[in-house]
């Protein structure tokens, strides 16, 4: 976003009237916090916690598996990804608390909140990764039961850190501390100062990579997938499936106002009055897409109580059943019944 | 209207110290920073710190390493700058110079004279 | 530190013709609030600095209406639409978005 997206409180006798009130004194801290930001930090606090918790949690139920189920894999790299991302939250929290001020230097400033962008590419290259997964086992289930191992889901999460990366480079390089000479304060953000131009294009690809390339494949993966297992009872793996197009809805559902808000700022000047109120909301438009640090977790838990029924089971077991289910194609004209139970035990050691 | 005026002219050995003050009149002393800037001969403007006289609050610009100390006396409305360790690249015109935070303007608008200062052996 | 550059560094001048003096930041000057602390002061032979302009475009008081800024980000231009014996002296533009505190170079206006 431009020049520095994060504003400053409000001076009531501070640049608004040509007048002087020379008996005024001068509050160079202001106590109140505007209500974008309030929102921000509870949002913050909510998802520090259940991200923290519910991630660590997911974690440590998918790393059992993850040797041999290759779901578990495709789980286990996203709750990393947004546990890393909650990690920053106490630091941002600060942050907003003291109006914005950045009193953690340089190097935080150019690591902490690239975080939460290094979950963004991340998340959606493995979403990609796992809808691809998804694709295989309905349309090339032969192609699966020969080639579908947990080496080849390692290689694609690598792959997908990797150029999550790459990806998160450019936002990394032009983040930079700026000391305001009054009010006095630190800031952290993105400066671009003389190069419009590639400040757009950062915003862009962030806009077209990050979201708009991901939701068209993936919806379009997902409309085929969802036919095939509809029309023809296609997979046993519904329920990892109704899994997926939950986490991949959420993740559009957050991110949006961010990206919108970023192409939108990228586009204005910083001092006209659109620029300034999409300044406001930035904490909020961030916080709001934090929120796929911590929903994936509670999709889970949902999810698992909704196939348990009423079956009453602990967290861990809930969270196993739902995560390290393996997905087993059953194609009717293909195969017999023995063949589809000899291929789910073979599966079952993947 | 405001005034600042400014002590008179010094002539300092290299290593010693200059302290330089600043009166001011005609507004609200309390409510502004007093900035210092100096200016070398036939050289620009050159921004040295700030102090803020109602809590003491200063700023330095980081180029003078500790060196130079900022200090206001708000039942006199004066300011202080004081250099130590002169060099002769110090030699000088030093200004105090008002930043007032109440109005609109949120500039540096009014200066004092300026202070000589000679740094020789 | 924000680098202050302006240009021309000598300007000489007709009486009554236009002046313009330009000045570029290494950093953008847009304040988080959304103003531009970008200042210009005039030094007359022998004097203290005087404010100009503040803000980019505001005219401090007192000073003649022939005074003009203008620009945005980094760029920024003091215009004399009428050149006065007066005018002479070094113009300096300032910003006071950033510490510390930086001002350009100077451009000395003489007459022609």
């Known amino acids: 976003m431009n020049s520095f997206n994060y504003t400053t409180p409000d001076y009531g006798h501070y640049d608004d009237k040509d007048t002087l009130d020379l008996n005024t004194p001068v509050d160079k801290t202001s106590n109140t916090l505007r209500v974008p930001d309030i929102l921000a930090l509870v949002i913050f606090a909510v998802v520090f916690l259940v991200g923290v918790l519910g991630n660590a949690l997911v974690v440590w139920v998918t790393a059992f598996e993850a040797k041999r189920t290759i779901n578990a894999i495709w789980f286990l790299n996203l709750a990393v990804a947004d546990f890393l991302s909650c990690l920053a939250l106490p630091i941002l929290f600060t942050s907003i608390v003291q109006h914005h001020h950045w009193p953690f230097g340089g190097a935080a400033c150019s690591i902490l909140p690239s975080l939460i962008l290094l979950n963004m590419y991340a998340s959606i290259l493995l979403l990609a990764t796992i809808s691809a997964d998804r694709f295989l086992l309905v349309f090339k289930p032969i192609w699966c039961q020969n080639f579908r191992g947990a080496g080849l889901a390692w290689i694609a999460c690598a792959v997908a850190w990797g150029l999550a990366l790459l990806l998160t480079i450019p936002s990394f390089l032009y983040r930079v501390v700026r000391e305001e000479y009054f009010p006095p304060k630190v800031l952290c953000g993105v400066d671009y100062s003389h190069d419009k131009r590639r400040e757009r294009a950062v915003a862009i690809v962030r806009l077209v990579l990050g979201f708009l390339w991901p939701l068209l494949t993936l919806t379009i993966c997902y409309t085929f997938i969802l036919l095939r297992t509809w029309s023809r009872r296609a997979t046993r793996s519904t329920k990892t499936l109704k899994v997926v197009v939950a986490v991949v809805a959420s993740f559009f559902i957050f991110w949006l106002p961010y990206q919108v808000t970023g192409i939108m700022m990228s586009f204005l000047e910083p001092s006209s009055p659109t620029f300034l109120l999409l300044n406001k909301l930035d904490s909020l438009c961030v916080s709001f897409a934090y929120i796929n640090c911590c929903i994936n977790p509670i999709i889970y838990v949902v999810a698992g109580q909704g196939f348990q029924g009423r079956l009453r089971k602990s967290l861990p077991s809930l969270l196993r059943n739902v995560l390290t289910e393996e997905s087993v194609v059953r194609e009717s004209k293909s195969f017999t019944r023995s063949t589809v139970d000899t291929m789910a035990q073979k599966t079952q050691a993947v | 209207q405001v005034q600042l005026v400014q002590s008179g002219a010094e002539v300092k050995k290299p290593g010693a110290s200059v302290k330089i003050s600043c009166k001011a009149s005609g507004y609200a002393f309390s409510n502004s920073w007093m900035n210092w800037v100096r200016q070398a001969p036939g050289k620009g403007l050159e921004w040295m710190g700030r102090i803020y006289p109602g809590d003491g609050d200063t700023k330095y610009n980081g180029k003078f390493k500790g060196r130079v100390t900022i200090t206001a006396d708000e039942s006199t409305s004066t300011a202080y700058m004081e250099l130590s360790s002169l060099r002769s690249e110090d030699s000088a015109v030093y200004f105090c110079?008002?930043?007032?935070?109440?109005?609109?303007?949120?500039?540096?608008?009014?200066w004092g004279q300026g202070t000589t200062v000679t740094v020789s052996s | 530190d924000v680098v202050m550059t302006q240009s021309p560094l000598s300007l000489p001048v007709t009486l009554g013709q236009p002046a313009s003096i330009s000045c570029r930041s290494s950093q953008s000057l847009v304040h988080s609030n959304g103003n531009t602390y970008l200042h210009w002061f005039q030094q007359r032979p022998g004097q203290s600095p005087r404010l100009l302009i503040y803000k980019v475009s505001n005219r401090f008081s007192g000073v003649p209406d022939r005074f003009s800024g203008s620009g945005s980000g980094t760029d920024f231009t003091l215009k004399i639409s009428r050149v006065e014996a007066e005018d002479v002296g070094v113009y300096y533009c300032?910003?006071?978005?950033?510490?510390?505190?930086?001002f350009g170079g100077g451009t000395k206006l003489e007459i022609k």
């Open positions: 300032s910003q006071s978005t950033l510490v510390p505190l930086t």
């Open positions: 110079a008002r930043f007032l935070l109440i109005s609109t303007v949120t500039a540096v608008d009014y």
